[in-house]
Interface confidence: medium
C-alpha cells in the first residue's frame, strides 16, 4: 500500500517548495462565487483543488494545476519531462493497492504487477498513493503498455494534465470531497 | 472472532527502546493495515502511523519519524512497534488497532474496528 | 495538520437524557469523521465512521450525522453503561487525529 503516504520521504516531498508563498495556507477569501483553484499544500507537499470565492484570498493560488506545481515543487518540470520522455514503467506502478482511509466509494483503476495489467478498484477519495487512475485508458498508457501504443503515451497524459505527477498521492479530482479552507 | 493481544508492560529508562507485539487472529492478518496509536495517563488519544502487513509499506505520523519503526512477522500474525530514544513523555498506553487494506463496493467495515488491549510502556529514570 | 475540537469538554447527565457532543475540524473533511467511546483502562470501542454509520453491534440510541467541518454524536437516551469518554477522529488526511475528548459524567 501507500509506501509513498503524505508522511514518508519521498523525492520531492522532502525538498522545501519554491517561494515563501506556497508555505500559505489555502484562502477562499471573503467574496462567494465557486472558481475552482488549486494551492500547494505544504503538508502533503502536493497541488490540490480547493474551491476560490473570486477575491482577495493570497498568492498561493493558481488558474491551473500544471502551474501550481510548475512554481511550488521543486524539480517537478525536470521529474515530468524525464518520466515523459522514458518509456520504462513509472515506479509507483508497483505500488500496491491503496483505497485511502475516506470512504467516497469511487471506480477507479490501478495497474497490477502480479497480472501485468491495469485492473478496477475502489477508491476511498483521499490518501492513497499513485497507483490511481481515472480511466482505465490512462492506466495502460502509463503502466500496462508506457511509450508505446498510438498517441504520445506519456506525453499525451502530462499535456492534458490529467493526473498528478508527483510523489505522495492520488490524482486530486476531489469529486466528493472540495476543501473549503 | 477477531483478536488483536498485546504484549505486557514495559518499564524502561530515558534514552532506551521498547518493542511492543500485537499478534492478531480471527482474520487474514495481511489483508487489512495496523494502526498503532497511544494514550499518554489522563490524556486524548494520539495516531503515530500504519504497517501494511502484506508488503512492510509503512506511514508514520512525522511527530515520530525517526524514532518509531513498524515491523510484522507473517509466519505469527504480529505487528511490532518500536520506538527508540524514549523520553518520559512518552509514557502512555500504546494500542493496536485495525485498519481496512481494500474497500469493497458495499461499505461493510471499518477502520479501527478492532483494538488491542494496550501495553502500558513507563519511562523513568 | 487538521485540529479537531470538540465541545463539551465534560458534561454531567441522567439517565435518559438526550445528549449532544460535537467535534468541529479546523478544514474540511467531508464524511471522513469517526466517534469512540472509552472507559477508563479499556481501549476505545469503534461507534459511528464515515460521520453517520452505526458499526456493528452498537445500539442505535447512538447517531452520528455532520459533513465538512460540523459534526455531532447524539444519545438519545442515556443508559449507565454510556457514561464514559467520547472522542472523535478525522480519517481525511496524515496525520490521523483525534479530538481532546468529552467526558460524559453521572449527574
Known amino acids: 500500500l501507500s509506501e509513498e503516504a503524505d508522511d514518508t520521504d519521498s523525492e520531492l516531498g522532502s525538498m522545501k517548495p519554491l517561494h515563501t508563498f506556497c508555505a500559505m495556507k489555502a484562502d477562499d477569501g471573503p467574496c462567494k462565487a465557486m472558481i475552482r483553484s488549486y494551492f500547494f499544500n505544504m503538508y502533503t507537499h502536493q497541488c490540490e483543488e480547493f474551491i476560490y470565492g473570486g477575491c482577495e484570498g493570497n498568492e498561493n493560488r493558481f488558474d491551473t494545476l500544471e502551474e501550481c506545481k510548475k512554481t511550488c515543487i521543486p524539480g517537478y518540470e525536470k521529474t515530468a519531462v524525464k518520466a515523459a520522455s522514458g518509456a520504462e514503467r513509472p515506479d509507483f506502478c508497483f505500488l500496491e493497492e491503496d483505497p485511502g482511509l475516506c470512504r467516497g466509494y469511487m471506480k477507479r483503476y490501478l495497474y497490477n504487477n502480479q497480472t501485468k495489467q491495469c485492473e478496477r478498484f475502489v477508491y476511498g477519495g483521499c490518501l492513497g498513493n499513485r497507483n490511481n487512475f481515472e480511466t482505465l485508458d490512462e492506466c495502460k498508457k502509463i503502466c500496462e503498455n508506457p511509450g508505446g501504443g498510438s498517441g504520445g503515451g506519456l506525453n499525451d497524459i502530462f499535456e492534458a494534465q490529467k493526473i498528478e505527477w508527483h510523489e505522495g498521492g492520488p490524482p486530486h479530482h476531489h469529486h466528493h470531497h472540495h476543501h473549503h479552507h | 472472532q477477531v483478536q488483536l493481544v498485546q504484549s505486557g508492560a514495559e518499564v524502561k529508562k530515558p534514552g532506551a527502546s521498547v518493542k511492543v507485539s500485537c499478534k492478531a487472529s480471527g482474520y487474514t492478518f495481511t489483508g487489512y493495515y495496523m494502526h498503532w496509536v497511544r494514550q499518554a495517563p489522563g490524556q486524548g488519544l494520539e495516531w503515530m502511523g500504519w504497517?501494511?502487513?502484506?508488503?512492510?509499506?509503512?506511514n508514520y505520523a512525522q511527530k515520530f519519524q525517526g524514532r518509531v519503526t513498524m515491523t510484522r512477522d507473517t509466519s505469527i500474525s504480529t505487528a511490532y512497534m518500536e520506538l527508540s530514544r524514549l523520553r518520559s513523555d512518552d509514557t502512555a498506553v500504546y494500542y493496536c488497532?485495525?485498519?481496512?487494506?481494500?474497500?469493497?463496493?458495499?461499505?461493510?467495515?471499518?477502520?479501527?474496528?478492532?483494538w488491542g488491549q494496550g501495553t502500558l510502556v513507563t519511562v523513568s529514570s | 495538520a487538521i485540529q479537531l475540537t470538540q465541545s463539551p469538554s465534560s458534561l454531567s447527565a441522567s439517565v435518559g437524557d438526550r445528549v449532544t457532543i460535537t467535534c468541529r475540524a479546523s478544514q474540511g473533511i467531508s464524511s471522513s469523521l469517526a466517534w469512540y467511546q472509552q472507559k477508563p483502562g479499556k481501549a476505545p470501542k469503534l461507534l459511528i465512521y464515515a460521520a453517520s454509520t452505526l458499526q456493528s453491534g452498537v445500539p442505535s440510541r447512538f447517531s452520528g450525522s455532520g459533513s465538512g467541518t460540523d459534526f455531532t454524536l447524539t444519545i438519545s437516551s442515556l443508559q449507565p453503561e454510556d457514561f464514559a469518554t467520547y472522542y472523535c477522529q478525522q480519517l481525511d488526511s496524515y496525520p490521523l487525529s483525534f479530538g481532546q475528548g468529552t467526558k460524559l459524567e453521572i449527574k
Open positions: 488497532a485495525r485498519g481496512i487494506a481494500r474497500l469493497q463496493w458495499l461499505p461493510t467495515e471499518a477502520d479501527f474496528d478492532y
Open positions: 504497517i501494511n502487513p502484506n508488503s512492510g509499506g509503512t
